[in-house]
């Protein structure tokens, strides 16, 4: 997250870290046994880390649970990052408490102008690298689809939307992929891609979770 702030400890209880010996992506806990992340975060072996704030220190609230199933959307397109969404089934149920809890799926698509919370342990530098230990937060508005398409001509599908600031300076970045965009208490987006990070007229692009609610529910039902 570039241009954000240190989240209050465990204030984003649905945020998870995907770990393969290091943090490589974020994710969101949507029920006791399922996490939503980005399709491009797929790895054959993933440990899901819940209740994290400082990912380099054991603070006592963490739950480390291996992935039992990793299901990328069947129409995921590596080239365009269309359908950039993935479900992870945990090998055991998460213990839900004040520091580990679920986030609701959306009941309506994201509305232009809505203020959302984006979070992650990704790069905080728009050029170079500075990866934080503590979870970073960013408040950012949903941009209109017209502005989104104008920023990335020919690259924005109906399964994507933009959140952020056309003036640059505030954005998600490398390491934030798969993480949540939460608007009015609902998981509206999954961190997906962008041209660089926090660049002028290049806002962050996010997977539109609303378009996948049916797929998510059906996949969970078929794999329970």
């Amino acid at each position: 997250i570039v241009g954000g702030y240190n989240c209050e400890e465990n204030s984003v209880p649905y945020q998870v870290s995907l770990n393969s010996g290091y943090h490589f992506c974020g994710g969101s806990l949507i029920n006791e046994q399922w996490v939503v992340s980005a399709g491009h975060c797929y790895k054959s072996r993933i440990q899901v880390r819940l209740g994290e704030h400082n990912i380099e220190v054991l603070e006592g609230n963490e739950q480390f649970i291996n992935a039992a199933k990793i299901i990328r959307h069947p129409q995921y397109d590596r080239k365009t990052l269309n359908n950039d969404i993935m479900l992870i089934k945990l090998s055991s149920r998460a213990v839900i408490n004040a520091r580990v809890s679920t986030i609701s799926l959306p009941t309506a698509p994201p509305a232009t102008g809505t203020k959302c919370l984006i979070s992650g342990w990704g790069n905080t530098a728009s050029s170079g690298a500075d990866y934080p230990d503590e979870l970073q937060c960013l408040d950012a508005p949903v941009l209109s689809q017209a502005k989104c398409e104008a920023s990335y001509p020919g690259k924005i599908t109906s399964n994507m939307f933009c959140v952020g600031f056309l003036e640059g300076g505030k954005d998600s970045c490398q390491g934030d992929a798969g993480g949540p965009v939460v608007c009015n208490g609902q998981l509206q987006g999954v961190v997906s891609w962008g041209d660089g990070c926090a660049q002028k007229n290049k806002p962050g692009v996010y997977t539109k979770v609303y378009n996948y609610v049916k797929w998510i529910k059906n996949t969970i039902a078929a794999n329970s």
Epitope: Y22, C25, A38, H40, R78, L81, G128, Q174, W193, G204
Partner: antibody
Framework: QVQLVQSGAEVKKPGASVKVSCKAS????????ISWVRQAPGQGLEWMGW????????NYAQKLQGRVTMTTDTSTSTAYMELRSLRSDDTAVYYC??????????????????WGQGTTVTVSS | DIQMTQSPSSVSASVGDRVTITCRAS??????LAWYQQKPGKAPKLLIY???SLQSGVPSRFSGSGSGTDFTLTISSLQPEDFATYYC?????????FGGGTKVEIK
């Protein structure tokens, strides 16, 4: 098991070209990138460049720009490194190595977990 | 480009010794550092990735630490098969760069 198998040793004259192959097996070729690293006799490791096995996107070391070309053939899970206008100081062992793919906003980590056995290229008149 | 400076360039040690090798980056690279072991005539072998994560199959006597610009590889109790050259590599950004190497020799 996961492995990278490289082509055999080559002896070339100055000014010639060499093309080294690196055949991958035991994993999904297009889910990773391939780096090429060389080592001159008695010297350390020098990174030459990287190629995405999925997209073919490349990133070359500046000192080799214009002389090196990296390609992949996904149908045979093989990566290639061609070096042109060879000089005597190109004499080295050339290695291919597997690294993470670079996609979207996931963490970019350029470590190399699997290496080929190396290909000796000797440039001599 | 990010320069990687390794020290010492060589170290003489005995079986059972604790050996520490350091690597300094010319600019911050967070935790994106790898350590490799290379024996004569062989390809490098990954030991440690992301500064402190032990690669599968590597003995636990090898450990890595550090973040930002200063990193350390430690061999807690040197074994006969550990006599080799060790390289650090910044895995943060292109162009990828290696340290000059540290040769661990028998005293």
């Amino acid at each position: 098991q996961v492995q990278l198998v490289q082509s055999g040793a080559e002896v070339k004259k100055p000014g010639a070209s060499v093309k080294v192959s690196c055949k991958a097996s035991g994993y999904t070729f297009t889910s990773y990138g391939i780096s090429w690293v060389r080592q001159a006799p008695g010297q350390g490791l020098e990174w030459m460049g990287w190629i995405s096995a999925y997209s073919g996107d490349t990133n070359y070391a500046q000192k080799l720009q214009g002389r090196v070309t990296m390609t992949t053939d996904t149908s045979t899970s093989t990566a290639y490194m061609e070096l042109r206008s060879l000089r005597s100081d190109d004499t080295a062992v050339y290695y291919c190595a597997r690294g993470d793919e670079v996609v979207g906003k996931m963490t970019y980590y350029y470590g190399m977990d699997v290496w080929g056995q190396g290909t000796t290229v000797t440039v001599s008149s | 480009d990010i320069q990687m400076t390794q020290s010492p360039s060589s170290v003489s040690a005995s079986v059972g010794d604790r050996v520490t090798i350091t690597c300094r980056a010319s600019q911050g690279i967070s935790r994106w550092l790898a350590w490799y072991q290379q024996k004569p005539g062989k390809a490098p072998k990954l030991l440690i990735y992301a500064a402190s994560s032990l690669q599968s199959g590597v003995p636990s006597r090898f450990s890595g630490s550090g973040s930002g610009t200063d990193f350390t590889l430690t061999i807690s109790s040197l074994q006969p098969e550990d006599f080799a050259t060790y390289y650090c590599q910044q895995a943060n950004s292109f162009p990828i760069t290696f340290g000059g190497g540290t040769k661990v020799e028998i005293k």
